[in-house]
């Protein structure tokens, strides 16, 4: 039975040209995380972190995506096109699969604040 919940950073905003941390956290389960997939709104994969193989960053994002902190992802050199939904998919053992959603808004304004409050989607 799947008892866990995915907490995410929810809706966040960051400055164009800046960086942002995408973070999900699996709680309320003893399940082991075997793999975490990070993908964009159009289903394209950004990065994968496998418990036994480590990180794999997709070639198209190699210059702008850094693994971590933890199972999270750091997106750098943000452009307006980075605005949209991001998803973390947690493959766990023995529970199964959990999925979380983050919405990132990239702002032109220099007053953009990066909010990183954890939310349960």
């Amino acid at each position: 039975m799947m008892t866990g919940t995915i907490e995410t950073t929810g809706n966040i905003s960051a400055k164009k040209g800046g960086s942002v941390i995408l973070q999900c956290h699996l709680s309320s389960t003893m399940a082991q995380v075997t793999q975490v997939n990070w993908e964009q709104h159009d289903h394209s994969l950004l990065a994968i972190r496998n418990a036994e193989l480590g990180w794999h960053i997709y070639p198209a994002f190699k210059d702008r995506v850094a693994p971590g902190p933890g199972l999270g992802l750091t997106l750098q050199s943000l452009t307006m096109n980075d605005t949209g939904e991001y998803f973390c998919t947690y493959h766990t053992y023995p529970d199964g699969t959990y999925r979380g959603r983050i919405f990132l808004e990239v702002l032109e304004s220099s007053v953009a604040e990066h909010s990183a409050r954890f939310q349960i989607p």
Epitope: A51, L53, Y93, G96
Partner: antibody, heavy 119, light 107 residues
Framework: EVQLVESGGDLVKPGGSLKLSCAAS????????MSWVRQTPDKRLEWVAT????????YYPDSVKGRFTISRDNAKNTLYLQMSSLKSEDTAMYYC????????????WGQGTSVTVSS | DIQMTQSPASLSVSVGETVTITCRAS??????LAWYQQKQGKSPQVLVY???NLADGVPSRFSGSRSGTQYSLKINSLQSEDFGSYYC?????????FGGGTKLEIK
């Protein structure tokens, strides 16, 4: 060249046991997840078991859970499937397959070994 | 358990035609799907993984797509070597179920 060679298939009576082996070569076995898939006489493909690269995680469908055990010996580059309490519906060609890194699709398959469960 | 409904079960087509095979998942599997080809007397071979990624060495006339929970394999300008059986397989919730298969025959 990647090679997967299955062995151990046989004719066995219902309730019996059998152990299949799959010898792997041509790649770094210890860094790949591996699976067993069977093809029934009516040509349907059925996933049987999966084991992670290090052997820490094993997965089974309900149809074989508790009866079949997948294991691996990374020092010997060999994958195993221990089958017990065999039923007539387990009759099939059994393939071992390598999984794509970071994905679960199977990119290399062996030629298969035949298992017949009949009295 | 997630069910994969593959259609059609069989298809009779001519060389040069374009064919689309579909698999519908009973719930969202978020692109965790592969397509395989199997020729008579041979082992299956992967064509597409992660719904849209062409496996190494697979001709560009093959393509995978997704619309919601429906996944499609399209083969443009069928060649004689493309005839055989095709299967989809999902990878979600620690289960890896196959579709029922599609047999592609020469008309």
């Amino acid at each position: 060249e990647v090679q997967l060679v299955e062995s151990g298939g046989d004719l066995v009576k219902p309730g019996g046991s059998l152990k299949l082996s799959c010898a792997a070569s041509g790649f770094t076995f210890s860094t790949y997840g591996m699976s067993w898939v069977r093809q029934t006489p009516d040509k349907r493909l059925e996933w049987v078991a999966t084991i992670s690269s290090g052997g820490s995680y094993t997965y089974y469908p309900d149809s074989v859970k508790g009866r079949f055990t997948i294991s691996r010996d990374n020092a010997k580059n060999t994958l195993y499937l221990q089958m017990s309490s065999l039923k007539s519906e387990d009759t099939a060609m059994y393939y071992c397959a390598r999984q794509v890194h970071y994905f679960y699709a199977m990119d290399y398959w062996g030629q298969g070994t035949s298992v017949t469960v009949s009295s | 358990d997630i069910q994969m409904t593959q259609s059609p079960a069989s298809l009779s087509v001519s060389v040069g035609e374009t064919v689309t095979i579909t698999c519908r998942a009973s719930e969202n599997i978020y692109s965790n799907l592969a397509w395989y080809q199997q020729k008579q007397g041979k082992s299956p071979q992967v064509l597409v993984y992660a719904a849209t990624n062409l496996a190494d060495g697979v001709p560009s006339r093959f393509s995978g797509s997704r619309s919601g929970t429906q996944y499609s394999l399209k083969i443009n300008s069928l060649q004689s070597e493309d005839f055989g059986s095709y299967y989809c397989q999902h990878f979600w919730d620690n289960a890896y179920t196959f579709g029922g298969g599609t047999k592609l025959e020469i008309k």
